[in-house]
């Protein structure tokens, strides 16, 4: 069978080889398509309800005024010339429709390096057969499930026209220190060969590099956190980040009801002040970051100063914030 590719909505003429150029003709066309069950026979004398879909022209050719999805299938003509010689023509018809130019919707203007980000959703409407969508980074194809690339695809079919809508959502994890303005595009490749791909306009999101968080340092004075009863302990929270974050204090994992401050002074230490202290720095961009915990303990006169005392009472005693 001869393969014929026809665009949906366009006319199509199939020649009946060996047919006399004008009536009288001995020929018949047989169709096996989405409109038929088994074979439908059309003859030159026909003329009827099928004319809107396919009719035999005076020269014996079969004329389809506007090809549709249901016209995909086999078309056969059997003709006899004036000398009684029989000729058969056999066609396999496939139809296609090129969609509109694909578009990237819901596109991100900024991506964060090191974490997965949704880049956007590529949409193609009105294709047949369905075809495929693919993503490109700086002109090179992106391979799903490689190097932090993932793609979620969806295909829908219009209930009346039978044409396809494709959607493809791209997620990427940009590498730290990579291109600060990558160029993403999406292209539609038709399901039938010999038709070029359609590409979207590119998008160029910025890649934001989160500054690596330097540790929050907690400095204790006296060193080791062991102090005689009635002594003073000074805790200083050192955060390299700019602008300076807000500092809150914790004792035994519970926030202390104090205004934010980078320094915590514990004057006239008593048993109730013993415990594990830490500070929490809250950055507007990164969220909270906690320091290591230090133990504050009381040493009775004559004891060696331990580097870490045991956790004592729950009272707050007298606190001073510098």
């Amino acid at each position: 069978a001869q393969n014929i590719t026809a665009r949906i909505g366009e006319p199509l003429v199939l020649k009946c080889k060996g047919a006399p150029k004008k009536p009288p003709q001995r020929l018949e066309w047989k169709l096996n398509t989405g409109r038929t069950e088994a074979w439908k026979v059309l003859s030159p004398q026909g003329g009827g309800p099928w004319d809107s879909v396919a009719r035999v022209l005076p020269n014996g050719s079969l004329f389809l005024p506007a090809v549709g999805i249901q016209d995909e299938g086999i078309f056969r003509c059997q003709a006899m010339n004036r000398n009684g010689k029989e000729t058969k023509s056999n066609y396999r018809v496939r139809v296609y429709q090129i969609p509109g130019k694909p578009e990237i919707v819901d596109s991100a203007s900024e991506l964060t390096a090191g974490v997965p980000n949704k880049v956007g959703t590529c949409v193609s409407e009105g294709s047949y057969p369905a075809g495929t969508l693919s993503w490109h980074l700086d002109g090179k194809p992106l391979v799903p499930n490689e190097k932090g690339v993932s793609v979620k695809e969806q295909t829908r079919r219009h209930p009346e026209t039978g044409l396809f809508t494709l959607q493809s959502e791209l997620m990427v994890t940009p590498a730290r220190g990579g291109d600060p303005r990558p160029t993403f595009s999406c292209s539609f490749s038709p399901g039938l060969p010999r038709h070029r791909a359609l590409r979207t306009a590119p998008i160029q999101p910025r890649v934001w590099e989160p500054v690596p968080l330097e540790e929050v340092q907690l400095v204790v004075e006296p060193e080791g956190g062991a102090v005689a009863p009635g002594g003073t302990v000074t805790l200083t929270c050192e955060v390299p980040a700019q602008p300076s974050p807000q500092i809150h204090w914790m004792k035994d994992g519970v926030p202390l009801p104090l205004p934010p401050s980078p320094v915590l002074i514990l004057p006239e230490i008593g048993p109730q002040d013993q415990g594990t202290y830490s500070c929490v720095a809250t950055h507007s961009s990164h969220g909270p970051q906690e320091s290591r915990a230090v133990s504050i303990s009381i040493i009775e006169p004559g004891e060696e100063g331990p580097t870490a005392g045991s956790v004592g009472g729950s009272g707050l005693g007298t606190l001073a914030l510098a």
């Epitope: 309800p49 004319d51 879909v53």
Partner: antibody, heavy 119, light 107 residues
Framework: EVQLVESGGGLVQPGGSLRLSCAAS????????MTWVRQAPGKGLEWVAS????????YYPDSVKDRFTISRDNAKNSLYLQMNSLRAEDTAVYYC????????????WGQGTLVTESS | DIQMTQSPSSLSASVGDGVTITCQAS??????VNWFQQKPGKAPRRLIY???NLADGVPSRFSGSRSGTDFTLTISSLQPEDFATYYC?????????FGGGTKVEIK
């Protein structure tokens, strides 16, 4: 909403002529074939004529061929049936219907107009 | 020409009954059959298109089926408004041919 409204029916002498009209609205008229169907009093439905969407091709049963002519004016969204040499057996309610080809069949119908041959 | 032989020509039934009407085509007409309902003094209304498809706005108690050249209209549970005359139509070839009609009456 698809609407088909027939007019032009009435009493006619044997051998006389009558022209029926059908005004269409609520759809793209020139996308559809159109058809006339009739129903004699107390009887079933009978196909009378069909015309393709462009108006280039017309179709009739033997019972009315050469006497009736179907036509259309796509600019006016109108369908017509010119009936000549009327006979007693042409007495019927005449319906205008959308379609007549394999893509549509007959989907929407007008309310009909009565043609009576006075013999 | 194609003949569409419709049966029965009339039937009596009660509200709630199931009803089956058949049309037999004299030759293959594919799926190209419609079913219509007509009430006295009114235009026909399409119920089923292409043998098995329910037209818009038609209650789901109506259904169409096909086996070769035999076509069936089924009303699963008759309602008072279903008492009417029903016609089949083949539109695969000219002349377009209607069945003779089936009058569904109240028992």
């Amino acid at each position: 909403e698809v609407q088909l409204v027939e007019s032009g029916g009435g009493l006619v002498q044997p051998g006389g002529s009558l022209r029926l009209s059908c005004a269409a609205s609520g759809f793209t008229f020139n996308n559809y074939w159109m058809t006339w169907v009739r129903q004699a009093p107390g009887k079933g439905l009978e196909w009378v004529a069909s015309i393709d969407n462009s108006g280039d091709n017309t179709y009739y049963p033997d019972s009315v061929k050469d006497r009736f002519t179907i036509s259309r004016d796509n600019a006016k969204n109108s369908l017509y049936l010119q009936m000549n040499s009327l006979r007693a057996e042409d007495t019927a309610v005449y319906y205008c219907a959308r379609g007549g080809d394999i893509t549509t069949g007959l989907d929407y119908w007008g309310q009909g107009t009565l043609v009576t041959e006075s013999s | 020409d194609i003949q569409m032989t419709q049966s029965p020509s009339s039937l009596s039934a009660s509200v709630g009954d199931g009803v089956t009407i058949t049309c037999q085509a004299s030759q293959d007409v594919g799926i190209y059959v419609n079913w219509f309902q007509q009430k006295p003094g009114k235009a026909p209304r399409r119920l089923i298109y292409r043998a098995t498809n329910l037209a818009d706005g038609v209650p789901s108690r109506f259904s169409g089926s096909r086996s070769g050249t035999d076509f069936t209209l089924t009303i699963s549970s008759l309602q008072p408004e279903d008492f009417a005359t029903y016609y089949c139509l083949e539109f695969d070839e000219h002349p377009l041919t209607f069945g003779g009609g089936t009058k569904v009456e109240i028992k």
